[in-house]
């Protein structure tokens, strides 16, 4: 984090959002593959 | 002295847009850093608005925000933007910019009144 | 939508004495305890007083703590000083992929009896 300015509370917090949004993203593409395929 | 600074507010019209700065000194800002900012309208708590990532500039918004504002930065400059437009008399408020909301800014007041 | 509820609103208190101040949130805050606490007096931004439910933050004396995770969460002050009355603000994170990523709760004015 900056500095050692602030927590690494936040950052931890949203690298879980991200790789939360990451997931489904692709959990998602994959859905709409299978979807397609059918 | 690690500090945020918010300036751009004042007195706008109803339908009317504002830019509202937040500049960081006293750090560098990092990957890891978000820029969040938050108001308070007179008399009343706290509202968050939205944050942005300063590494990727990813950003998400309070769902009432409804697109009239955006959120923006500028890495080689260490500060983050407010873009209100289509302004009402309820958005008149102090507008905070607050890194990782742990550290705040002074806040800068924003009337909207004709 | 996120309902974040602070009680009380008001709180008249003297010095020394013990104060809890109460979060309640729906829905659950992420992973239980990514909650945070605020301090504002007036004209003045919020101080960053507890983050993740319970830990202080750099710099806030030891006689303000906090506890609870999921949906319920309590501010304490051991013994209120001179300088602890103020407003007092709790700030749940969310998962953002369903909700808001933040919402604050009302306020608590702690104000002299």
């Known amino acids: 984090h900056s500095d050692g300015i602030f927590t690494d509370s936040y950052s931890r917090y949203r690298k879980q959002m991200a790789v939360k949004k990451y997931l489904a993203a692709v959990l998602g593409k994959r859905y709409k593959q299978r979807v397609k395929n059918k | 002295e690690v500090q945020l600074v918010e300036s751009g507010g004042g007195l706008v019209q109803p339908g009317g847009s504002l830019r509202l700065s937040c500049a960081a000194s006293?750090?560098?800002?990092?990957?890891?850093?978000?820029i969040c900012w938050v108001r308070q309208a007179p008399g009343k708590g706290l509202e968050w608005i939205g944050c942005?990532?300063?590494?990727?500039?990813?950003?998400d918004y309070a769902n009432w925000v409804n697109g009239r504002f955006t959120i923006s930065r500028d890495i080689s400059k260490n500060t983050g933007y407010l873009q209100m437009n289509s302004l009402r008399a309820e958005d008149t408020a102090v507008y905070y910019c607050?890194?990782?909301?742990?550290?705040w800014g002074q806040g800068t007041l924003v009337t909207v009144s004709s | 939508d996120i309902q974040m509820t602070q009680s009380p609103s008001t709180l008249s208190a003297s010095v020394g004495d013990r104060v809890t101040i109460t979060c309640q949130s729906s829905?659950?805050?992420?992973?239980?305890?990514?909650l945070s606490w605020y301090q504002q007096k007036p004209g003045k931004a919020p101080k960053f007083l507890i983050y993740?439910?319970?830990k202080l933050a750099s710099g806030v004396p030891s006689r303000f703590s906090g506890s609870g995770s999921g949906t319920e969460f309590t501010l304490t002050i051991s013994s209120l000083q001179p300088d602890d009355f103020a407003t007092y603000y709790c700030?749940?994170?969310?998962?953002?992929?369903?909700?808001?990523?933040?919402?604050f709760g009302g306020g608590t004015k702690v104000e002299i009896k």
């Open positions: 607050a890194g990782n909301l742990e550290i």
């Open positions: 006293g750090f560098t800002v990092s990957r890891d850093y978000w």
């Open positions: 942005i990532s300063a590494g990727g500039g990813s950003t």
């Open positions: 829905p659950s805050i992420y992973s239980g305890a990514f």
């Open positions: 993740e439910a319970s």
């Open positions: 700030l749940g994170f969310y998962d953002c992929s369903s909700v808001d990523c933040h919402a």
